[in-house]
């Protein structure tokens, strides 16, 4: 129950108070007493309950016609059962009684009141009155957890601004209104009473920037909606008529958690008294409701796919035209970011990875947009983010960046457990340097920081420095699978192409040629690849540095050694001896369900099938999936990526809710 | 086989800042690394940065780390040295270098750290 | 004081061999393949004459060559001939902070 504030009683004059039901109020009984008096009795309005203690040991006694020592160890509370019809309409009596002289009463006139901020602390969806039953104050994870949730209101419904909603400080219509949080203050008072006591809705100064609540007008159009709390304005007084009343006001956050901002938002309403002009308002009663911003969360590739995006670019027909029969076959919706919009820039994945938030009325897909800020710069926050899509970017807008922080180089897991700590919504991939030098690359700090501050997918930094573009989407890719724990790990695997390819030169097709078909290109049998020695040297490298992962991902994401599958792929080192795929890099796939978008190989063709693509299908049809092979290799392999690096997938949110998890 | 070009050179005081341009013609860039060397007058040679082909990583001198930014735009087939800060020490001829076309063998060991192309250099004077 | 050592100067007559040392150390010459050879001709830019310790672009005679043992590297010229006084610079990769490491250069004079 939520504390009121201490009144002291006087016999020399009545005390007027007020409580508000839900309240708990501590009465001094004794510091006023009369000096000969050693114990007293209490009557009290059929409104009131009193409770007297005596500790310690504390015994509770509700008032009765008992009389009581008069000693500090005495506790008297009171609460109030029914708001007051008038002023003062609810008395208490206290009667002191001391040997020698006759009984002394002091009178207390109690107005009770009901004040209480409500917003959904029980994650229903609904605001219903807590009465303050619950301790709104706190904010708890878990299943049985409780706290209320703000949405970073981070789309733009307003098709003609080019801002975001949480940017301005209007309410633009019923839309913009349903991003936000609903809070009720409800008020039952005598009539008069707010002649004499005053209401503020108030946040603290160091959450200010990061919230803004908007007053609804009952029963008229959101577009009466005005700003009553933001960054401009901490506190706020607030008109409130005497009786019965509910005020509606809608919470907008303007700031995802990140290191300096841990989500938490209070907000909290005072019941000030201002009956004496003489002196300052003294505060009577606060209540607060404690919102935590709704992270941005990141899908795995074994959620469902709903939208698939690419760039046409110089002749790419051919690779869009298999990506959108892909996707149709997955059943998503497909969007072409045209040539004159891309600028020539076709790495889709790598400027923009799309996650979600959700708060229990609204779900809402967010595009966080890397810093890169290439040729697409502009197309996340021109083209992606609108009406019910959200926004958000992080990290130096111009320069300080490194190819770490494009966002081939993000990823998360599928659901996972990890030696009994449970990861319901994945853990977040990002690569890095083994050990920082002056040259070594890493992800911004700026992007790190926002990435562990969400706190529901917590990173694993992986070592990507070894390849030339330096992206974890260069060595490894989740697939869905019907069993174990319901996806595979597909790890680039240059010791997997070795065998195969020794396997079949012992079969006899050493003379068989790598990147055949393809103009232009050197062709390579098999038996010179595996002669190479320099090749071989540099695959063992590669071989090591992968395998490093592989043992930090087993340990991250408590996998077992079924739970990997081996891509045959070879790599090269190049400028500065960073690795690059010396084929198509196979595990650079666009995942859609069970429709898998590969880059075609090119490897040798034995028994009129390439060898490559059979192995991959062997390794990944018995799990329900359907391998397509894409011909990236001109306008995506040559330039150091592949499918996935070119193409861009928003997922159905989890149907897990991340307030329900324990981080 | 490419060619290089560099510009931008010329007479800046201690503290100021120039950028150098370093164009290709006859074959595209985006193929090759870049790398910056100078000489200074009547001296050695110095390797400055480097960029490579893919775009996606550079490295720097200690010299002149955190004074120095080298970055590339494909579509002006033309790399930058975006020079802060400078000291009399920078005073040098700069050349921009690149790789010669990739030998297409099934692997080209020990790329980024030799320069087959060099232009013709540009004189950078810092004095007051 | 450049971070790899050459001998400031050398010189032999026409038809000798000269063999330039370029002196490192185990963080650099000593551990990579990767030392090139660059001659200078006064006024004009420097040419690539050798890369990955022995191997020559094409268009370098076979006269110059180039070998490694332990932490030194050395280039030699046979069959010398006038054009090929010049300046030579040898290169290293290196594990120090800054990857790319010169010789202070060794002029060759053809007497």
């Known amino acids: 129950m939520a504390q009121g504030t201490l009144i002291r009683v006087t016999p020399e004059q009545p005390t007027h108070a007020v409580c508000v039901l839900g309240t708990l109020t501590q009465l001094d009984i004794c510091s006023s007493a009369p000096e000969d008096c050693t114990s007293f009795s209490i009557n009290a309005s059929p409104g009131v309950v009193v409770d007297i203690a005596h500790g310690p040991p504390a015994k509770k006694k509700s008032t009765g016609s008992s009389t009581w020592p008069l000693d500090p160890g005495v506790e008297v509370t009171l609460t109030m059962k029914v708001a007051s019809g008038s002023t003062g309409d609810q008395k208490v009596q206290i009667s002191y009684y001391g040997p020698k002289t006759p009984p002394v009463k002091a009178l207390l006139y109690l107005t009770g009141v009901e004040i209480s901020l409500c917003a959904d602390i029980t994650r229903t969806g609904k605001v219903k009155p807590t009465r303050a039953v619950k301790d709104q104050r706190t904010w708890t994870w878990g299943p049985c957890g409780q706290g209320a949730i703000l949405l970073v209101n981070c789309d733009r419904d307003n098709l003609e601004s080019s801002a975001m909603d949480c940017e301005d400080d209007e309410v633009l219509d019923s839309e913009d209104l349903q991003d936000m949080s609903l809070m009720t203050l409800s008020t039952k008072t005598p009539k008069d009473f707010f002649t004499n006591h005053t209401l503020v809705l108030h946040v603290a100064r160091s959450e200010m920037d990061k919230v803004r609540v908007f007053q609804a007008t009952r029963g008229k159009l959101s577009s009466k909606c005005s700003v009553v709390l933001g960054p401009k304005w901490p506190s706020h007084y607030l008109m409130v008529p005497g009786g019965k009343h509910n005020m509606d006001f809608y919470v907008e956050a303007l700031a995802f958690p990140d290191t300096d901002f841990p989500g938490l938002i209070t907000l909290t309403i005072s019941l000030l008294d201002t009956s004496n002009l003489e002196l300052p308002e003294a505060v009577v009663f606060q209540d607060s409701v404690v919102f935590r911003v709704a992270p941005w969360i990141m899908t795995p590739n074994t959620q469902p796919p709903q939208e698939v995006y690419a760039c046409s670019i110089f002749e790419n027909e051919d690779f869009l035209k298999s990506v959108t029969t892909l996707a149709m076959k997955a059943k998503c919706k497909l969007t072409i970011c045209p040539e004159e919009e891309n600028m020539d820039d076709q790495w889709m994945q790598d400027e923009m990875e799309i996650g979600y938030i959700q708060a229990p009325h609204k779900t809402l897909p967010v595009v966080f947009d890397s810093p890169r800020n290439r040729g697409l710069k502009e197309f996340p926050i021109k083209r992606v983010m609108g009406p019910d899509f959200g926004y958000v970017t992080r990290g130096p807008q111009t320069g300080g960046i490194s190819g770490l922080d494009s966002f081939g180089n993000l990823e998360v897991s599928p659901p996972v457990t990890v030696r009994g700590k449970e990861y319901p919504l994945g853990r977040i991939l990002f690569g890095d340097s083994c050990y920082p030098s002056n040259d070594s690359r890493q992800m911004h700090q700026a992007l790190q920081d926002f990435l562990s501050a969400q706190q529901v997918q917590a990173p694993v930094k992986l070592y990507s420095d070894w390849l030339s573009v330096g992206h974890v989407d260069e060595f490894l890719s989740f697939v869905p699978a019907p069993d174990r724990k319901g996806f595979r790990l597909l790890l680039a695997s240059p010791r997997s192409c070795y065998k195969l390819f020794q396997e079949q030169q012992n079969e006899g097709h050493g003379e068989a040629l790598l990147f055949e078909g393809i103009k232009k290109k050197k062709q390579q049998k098999i038996k010179n690849i595996l002669s190479n020695k320099t090749l071989r040297e540099h695959n063992s490298f590669v071989e090591r540095c992968i395998d490093w992962n592989r043992e930090l991902l087993k340990r991250e994401l408590g996998l077992a050694e079924s739970d990997i599958i081996d891509i045959p792929q070879l790599f090269k080192l190049k400028e500065f001896s960073k690795a690059e795929a010396f084929f198509p890099n196979m595990v650079n796939m666009l995942v859609l369900g069970k429709h898998l978008g590969i880059p075609k190989p090119f490897g040798p063709v034995i028994n009129g099938r390439c060898c490559l693509e059979e192995k991959v299908c062997s390794l990944l049809e018995p799990l329900g999936l359907q391998c397509t092979f894409i011909n990236d290799f001109f306008t995506y392999h040559i330039r150091h990526g592949e499918v996935h690096c070119g193409t861009n997938v928003r997922r159905k949110p989890f149907s897990f809710k991340w307030w329900n998890m324990v981080p | 086989q490419v060619q290089l070009v560099e510009s931008g050179g010329g007479l800046v005081k201690p503290g100021g800042s120039l950028r150098l341009s370093c164009a290709a013609s006859?074959?595209?860039?985006?193929?090759?690394?870049v790398s910056w060397i100078r000489q200074a007058p009547g001296k050695g040679l110095e390797w400055v940065s480097f960029v490579n082909s893919a775009n996606t990583f550079t490295y720097y001198a200690d010299s002149v780390r955190g004074r120095f930014t080298i970055s590339r735009d494909n579509a002006k087939n033309t790399v930058y040295l975006q020079m802060n800060s400078l000291r009399a020490e920078d005073t040098a001829v700069y050349y921009c270098?690149?790789?010669?076309?990739?030998?297409?063998?099934?692997?080209?060991?020990?790329?980024?750290?030799?320069?087959?192309?060099w232009g013709r250099g540009t004189l950078v004077t810092v004095s007051s | 004081q450049s971070a790899l050592t050459q001998p400031r100067s050398v010189s032999g007559s026409p038809g000798q061999s000269v063999t330039i040392s370029c002196t490192g150390t185990?963080?650099?010459?000593?551990?990579?393949?990767?030392v090139s050879w660059y001659q200078q001709h006064p006024g004009k830019a420097p040419k690539l004459i050798i890369y990955n310790v022995y191997e020559r672009p094409s268009g370098v005679p076979d006269r110059f060559s180039g070998s490694k043992s332990g932490n030194t590297a050395s280039l030699t010229i046979s069959g010398l001939q006038a054009e090929d006084e010049a300046d030579y610079y040898c290169s290293s990769h290196s594990r120090s902070s800054t990857p790319v490491l010169f010789g202070g250069g060794t002029k060759l004079t053809v007497l």
């Open positions: 270098t690149s790789d010669a076309p990739e030998v297409d063998d099934i692997v080209a060991p020990g790329r980024g750290y030799y320069m087959d192309v």
């Open positions: 006859g074959s595209t860039l985006s193929d090759y690394f």
């Open positions: 185990r963080g650099d010459v000593g551990r990579y393949n990767h």
